[in-house]
Interface confidence: medium
């Protein structure tokens, strides 16, 4: 049997067609191509909805940067 068979990997087959406002985004995770059909970013919104997005699009990259900065602990 394949390794990690009891831990199925979530995949993206299609990407959202519309840009999502960063104010609606809570977090993200990357999906790698070795386990799924496409490399993808899965955004989780503030209402816990998950949406697949294209990591090559600038708005997706900008949104990830924004979320990264949000999660960094503030320097005192």
């Amino acid at each position: 049997q394949p390794d990690a068979i009891n831990a199925p990997v979530t995949c993206c087959y299609n990407f959202t067609n519309r840009k999502i406002s960063v104010q609606r985004l809570a977090s993200y995770r990357r999906i790698t191509s070795s386990k799924c059909p496409k490399e993808a970013v899965i955004f989780k919104t503030i209402v816990a909805k998950e949406i697949c997005a294209d990591p090559k699009q600038k708005w997706v990259q900008d949104s990830m940067d924004h979320l990264d900065k949000q999660t960094q602990t503030p320097k005192t």
Epitope: P8, T10, F15, A53
Partner: nanobody, 125 residues
Framework: EVQLVESGGGLVQAGGSLRLSCAAS????????MGWFRQAPGKEREFVAA????????YYADSVKGRFTISRDNAKNTVYLLMNSLNPEDTAVYYC??????????????????WGQGTQVTVSS
């Protein structure tokens, strides 16, 4: 519960072809993607190809594009993987898997959580 049974593996010379079949049973597959993965000894499982059961959209790993073709026969609940121009690097156990898709096309799937037992493909040089 979903059952997946692969067949069609075997030994083939480099440059040859094989067609793998995956017969699915146990429930309705209208909202599934059916995928083929492979695992060579000592290596990680690797995505090969997938097809959406509902609309027939296909997806391929870069390493097999132009050589492998995935297709489906809805009437037989069977998915096929036609493998042409095989080379020794394609040697692996090939697994069929089912991935439950979300209603929203842009939502992530649940993940490949149903698997067949695998069929061995050996390509000799």
């Amino acid at each position: 519960e979903v059952q997946l049974v692969e067949s069609g593996g075997g030994l083939v010379q480099a440059g040859g072809s094989l067609r793998l079949s995956c017969a699915a049973s146990g429930r309705t597959f209208s909202n599934y993607a059916m995928g083929w993965f492979r695992q060579a000894p000592g290596k990680e499982r690797e995505f090969v190809a997938a097809i959406s059961w509902s609309d027939g959209s296909t997806y391929y790993a870069d390493s097999v594009k132009g050589r492998f073709t995935i297709s489906r026969d809805n009437a037989k609940n069977t998915v096929y993987l036609l493998m042409n121009s095989l080379n020794p690097e394609d040697t692996a156990v090939y697994y069929c898997a089912a991935d439950l898709l979300a209603e929203d096309p842009a939502a992530p799937s649940r993940g490949y959580d149903y698997w067949g037992q695998g069929t061995q493909v050996t390509v000799s040089s």
